[in-house]
């Protein structure tokens, strides 16, 4: 199957102090790579998870990721700051025969806004 | 420290069931998937099944399916092979190993001895 | 099948290096587990393709390319000398393999 990453939400609204889920879904797990979530592009892009182990403070994954049909890559992101407003997107690489991985793929992005905390 | 600890091998007839339990430490082991792999007298390693870290998804080699069963209890950080209809080619020592997050493996138990003879 | 061969020898402080073919570089990773006597615990030297666990000294190394993948020791020890495993995970299939093994022997 021709591989796609989609996120169905161009935007969220969060308010500090809460929490948001980003949705990302693939259609295919080959050709086999790590799955990455980044805000921004370009060469200030900043990771914010990555689906290969390492623990990333605030943010969790939605799904059972261990699955090995998993397609779900969606993440949570607990008690937003103001910080946290951006463009996040969901990325597939493809392994690569030396460091870095390749990557082959983006979701359309999701743009989060950050709400003042209600009085 | 991550350890395993296989228990439940020892010797039964051709025909018989065995569980074998692993006790896993020294990491948060409801995130992580597990398998079992076996090796036969002599011979190499051979992979046999695997579970996600819920639970919910198995996987198997075809030469066990449907007489193996993995599971696990995550709230007593255990690992689980129900092994049925066991012949003399089961006897092997089992070994549960923890997964990568892409199904390699990265820690091994010492492995539990099973012998199937009349 | 995972093709490894079955034996290697090396002089304390060359370079060996271990081949396994079979996979199918598009679907596949590799690790390698090494066994230093038969029916006692493997230790994984190195996983996906290339990692090397924290433990492992940094002589150990890996690489994967088309449909096969090399396990590298730079300055081999004779406390090296042991059975090493190549080892599989097939994303099309959802299945895992292992080579049969290559003796490694430092003479």
């Known amino acids: 199957k021709e591989l796609k990453v989609t996120q169905p939400e161009k935007s969220v609204s969060v308010a500090a102090g809460d929490s948001t889920v980003l949705n990302c879904t693939l259609t295919s797990l080959l050709p086999v790579g790590p799955i990455k979530w980044y805000r921004g592009v370009g060469q200030s892009r900043l990771l914010i998870y990555s689906f290969t182990g390492e623990h990333f403070p605030r943010v969790t994954n939605v799904s059972d990721a261990t699955k090995r049909n998993n397609m779900d890559f969606s993440i949570r992101i607990s008690n937003v700051t103001p910080e946290d407003a951006g463009t996040y997107y969901c990325v597939k690489f493809q392994k690569g025969p030396s460091e870095p991985d390749t990557e082959i793929q983006s979701g359309g992005g999701t743009e989060v806004y950050v709400l003042a905390k209600p009085s | 420290d991550v350890q395993l600890v296989e228990s439940g091998g020892g010797v039964v007839r051709p025909g018989e069931s065995l569980r074998l339990s692993c006790a896993a430490s020294?990491?948060?082991?409801?995130?992580?998937?597990m398998s079992w792999v076996r090796q036969a007298p002599g011979k190499g390693l051979e992979w046999l099944a695997g579970?996600?870290?819920?639970?919910?998804?198995?996987y198997y080699i075809d030469s066990v399916k449907g007489r193996f069963t993995i599971s696990r209890d995550n709230s007593k950080n255990s690992l689980y092979l129900q092994m049925n209809s066991l012949t003399a080619e089961d006897t092997a020592v089992y070994y549960c190993?923890?997964?990568?997050?892409?199904?390699?493996?990265?820690?091994w138990g010492l492995g539990t001895l099973v012998t199937v003879s009349s | 099948a995972l093709t490894q061969p079955a034996s290697v020898s090396a002089n304390p402080g060359e370079t060996v290096k271990i081949t396994c073919s079979g996979g199918d570089y598009y679907s596949t990773y590799y690790g390698w587990y090494q066994q230093k006597s038969p029916g006692s615990a493997p230790v994984t030297v190195i996983h996906s393709d290339d990692k090397r666990p924290s433990d492992i000294p940094s002589r150990f190394s890996g690489s994967a390319s088309g449909s096969a993948a090399t396990l590298t020791i730079t300055g081999v020890r004779v406390e090296d000398e042991a059975v090493y495993f190549c080892?599989?995970?097939?994303?099309?299939?959802?299945?895992?393999?292992f080579g049969a093994g290559t003796t490694l022997t430092v003479l």
């Open positions: 080892g599989a995970y097939d994303g099309r299939t959802y299945i895992n393999t």
């Open positions: 020294g990491f948060t082991f409801s995130s992580y998937a």
């Open positions: 579970i996600s870290a819920g639970g919910s998804d198995t």
């Open positions: 190993a923890r997964e990568t997050w892409n199904h390699l493996f990265d820690y």
